[in-house]
């Protein structure tokens, strides 16, 4: 009978065993150990037993002892087991984005590894387990399906081997592949909210804003605005779940027509688009023209106002007769005329709306000077010590220089608060000068004395 | 670090009994797999072991003489002392000890410097 | 019990090789061990476990064991190599010696 001690050996791979082979009878005629194993025979020994080292273990194996004795040949086994975690541990790339509400695969890759019986394979959501499963194969791949919310962003998944040989060893070896953190996402089926002018005037600037709620992260939301082949530059601003952009637009001639404009949200691997038409027209303000900015009075002036082809003037008011974009009257300037504005408001339609552009021009009549009873009246009677302001308004275009000189000295305060006295009263000659000529008027002051009263 | 002195009589007569001893420092008896084994050398002659006590106190002697040899330790003195018997001229040589650092490969990495007996009546 | 045999002599010139054998019955099975004894001197272990180095052994000292030879290599020999060599294994639970080989350093 030939022994083998230990009958079991669980090692590491690569590891080194030592084996007693032992023979019945004292003295064996042969005692050894067959094995395709590097082996050595060491100390101690004795004359019916020997120790053999066993080294680079790399594989199960099983050397076998035997011994011949008087009453026969015999041999046993010692098994040896190996264990190795695995080479290779890896959890398979995540999606880049994963949208919320829809399942994740999981898949864990392990190579290598023994005794794979002793093998779990478990797959996890930061420290908590999602599946557990025995590693089958050479090559195994573990999977599991989970559902993904919202709290799952940022969440790191990972897969863990367990190589447990607590049994034996009373060790249980784990392997940990690298973390993968998973981005979900949440884009609404609705498209984004776009509000913005519908026409759009050349070399005029308009405000566009785009916004859409039920977005998560927002944060990582981005957003296209695009005019034409005009590419916007938004301000966005961010609320809890939604957001908004706004950005300035600013059109050219070359732009005139029909444009889309286009907002995308971009979420994760979606996208939610919104597209509007945008009328850019070109509407420049309606022209006044006078005869002559500047006329004498009696001067007969012709006001005329031209617009856009398509658009409708009016002048002063007054609707072109027939409606269309011109319009024109003539007048006999007045004096009265100076300073009068004519104004010239065209309509055009674009794109069903009507937009409205006003011009002024103003006329100035050339008249005078003028001094009037009205104005500049010829009898002042004041009592004496009283406080008085003499009134004498010169009229004309251009405005005359006016004095009032009594013996061609002395000045009357015209428009100063004055004491009466006895000096004041006699004969003034006022005198209105303009570059149109000059006019006089007598003014006679009058000053009550108190013995009349 | 390691050392190994051994000591005993330098001239032993016939049939007399050699009581050598193996005093050592640098390392301990009772640490797992350590081993001091004799081995003696005539004038000019080869190498030849004796015998082998190791920190479980297990022992092992040369064949050839067995039934002559007996080896001991003292873990707590550092001490390994050999006894032979019955003493002849031919057993005129240098007595060594030696420390094997793993008894299982046989080896002895640090020895003494010897010491010379001579039988002789 | 196994028996260990070795040439009584070698001889080298200095900076060449120097190999000295052992043989005995299936030794590669088992771990050989070399010596190096100078006169009036201990013996030094200069290989162990057929073919590891002791820390201060220099490089050119290696072993090899496989088959029913051991053998001890001394590359580029200098004349301080000069002296006895032993080879020693086990024949359970004997500890065998053998008899020993002197390297003459020539010149």
């Known amino acids: 009978q030939t022994s083998v001690f230990p009958p079991e050996v669980i090692l590491p791979r690569g590891g080194s065993v030592k084996v007693n082979c032992s023979a019945s009878c004292d003295q064996p005629i042969l005692l050894g150990m067959e094995t395709p194993l590097p082996k050595k025979e060491i100390l101690p020994g004795g004359n019916n037993w020997k120790m053999y080292e066993l080294s680079n273990v790399q594989e199960d194996s099983q050397p076998m002892c035997y011994s011949n004795c008087p009453d026969g040949q015999s041999a046993a086994k010692t098994v040896l087991t190996v264990y190795w975690t695995p080479e290779r541990v890896e959890l398979a790339p995540l999606p880049p984005w994963q949208p919320v509400g829809k399942n994740l695969t999981l898949r864990c890759q392990v190579e290598g590894g023994a005794p794979r019986a002793n093998l779990t394979v478990v797959l996890l959501r930061g420290e908590k387990e999602l599946s557990r499963q025995s590693a089958v194969g050479e090559s195994a791949e573990v999977t599991t399906t989970v559902p993904v919310g919202r709290d799952d962003h940022g969440a790191n998944f990972s897969c863990r081997t367990e190589l447990d040989l607590r049994p034996y060893v009373l060790k249980l070896f784990e392997n940990t592949s690298a973390p993968h953190q998973l981005q979900t996402f949440d884009l609404p089926a609705t498209p984004p909210q776009l509000v913005s002018p519908q026409v759009l005037e050349v070399d005029t600037q308009g405000t566009v804003v785009c916004s859409l709620d039920g977005l998560f992260p927002v944060s990582e939301a981005q957003v296209y605005l695009a005019l034409g082949d005009q590419k916007l530059n938004p301000t966005i601003t961010y609320g809890d779940n939604s957001l908004s952009a706004k950005a300035s637009v600013k059109v050219t001639a070359e732009e005139e027509g029909t444009q889309q404009l286009l907002c995308a949200v971009m979420l994760g691997t979606q996208t939610q688009e919104t597209r509007q038409t945008v009328t850019i027209y070109s509407f420049p303000a309606p022209n006044v023209n006078l005869t002559k900015p500047e006329v004498s009075e009696g001067t007969e002036v012709i006001v005329e106002c031209e617009a856009h082809p398509r658009a409708k003037v009016m002048l002063n008011g007054v609707p072109a007769q027939p409606p269309g974009p011109r319009a024109q009257f003539v007048l006999k300037a007045t004096p009265e005329d100076n300073g009068r504005s004519f104004s010239c408001s065209a309509t055009l339609e674009v794109a069903g709306q009507l937009v409205h552009k006003n011009q002024t021009r103003e006329l100035r009549v050339l008249y005078g000077p003028r001094l009037d009873e009205k104005d500049c009246p010829g009898n002042w009677t004041w009592p004496e010590n009283s406080q008085q302001t003499p009134m004498c308004q010169a009229w004309g275009n251009p405005l005359p220089q006016l004095k009032c000189l009594k013996d061609g000295t002395f000045p009357l305060p015209i428009g100063q608060s004055v004491t009466v006295t006895r000096d004041l009263e006699g004969t003034y000659l006022c005198q209105a000068r303009s570059t149109r000529g000059e006019v006089t008027r007598e003014v006679t002051v009058n000053v009550l004395s108190p013995r009349y009263e | 670090q390691v050392q190994l002195k051994e000591s005993g009589p330098a001239l032993v007569k016939p049939t007399q009994t050699l009581t050598l001893t193996c005093t050592f420092s640098?390392?301990?008896?009772?640490?797992?797999?350590?081993?001091v084994g004799w081995i003696r050398q005539p004038p000019g002659k080869a190498l030849e072991w004796l015998a082998l006590i190791d920190w479980d106190d297990d022992k092992y002697y040369s064949t050839s003489l067995k039934t002559r040899l007996t080896i001991s330790k003292d873990t707590s003195k550092n001490q390994v002392v050999l006894t032979m018997t019955n003493m002849d001229p031919v057993d005129t040589a240098t007595y060594y000890c030696a420390r094997y650092p793993v008894t299982q490969r046989s080896y002895m990495d640090v020895w003494g410097q010897g010491t010379l007996v001579t039988v002789s009546s | 019990d196994i028996e260990l045999t070795q040439p009584p002599s070698v001889s080298v010139a200095p900076g060449q090789t120097a190999r000295i054998s052992c043989s005995g019955d299936?030794?590669?099975?088992?771990?050989a061990s070399w010596y190096q004894q100078k006169p009036g001197q201990a013996p030094v272990l200069v290989i162990y476990?057929?073919?590891d180095r002791p820390s201060g052994i220099p490089e050119r000292f290696s072993g090899s064991n496989s088959g029913n030879t051991a053998t001890l290599t001394i590359s580029g020999t200098q004349a301080e190599d000069e002296a006895d060599y032993y080879c020693?294994?086990?024949?359970?639970?004997?500890?065998?010696f053998g008899g020993g080989t002197k390297l003459t350093v020539l010149g």
């Open positions: 020693q294994s086990y024949d359970s639970p004997q500890v065998v």
């Open positions: 476990d057929d073919s």
């Open positions: 640098g390392f301990s008896l009772s640490t797992s797999g350590v081993g």
């Open positions: 299936a030794l590669g099975d088992k771990y």
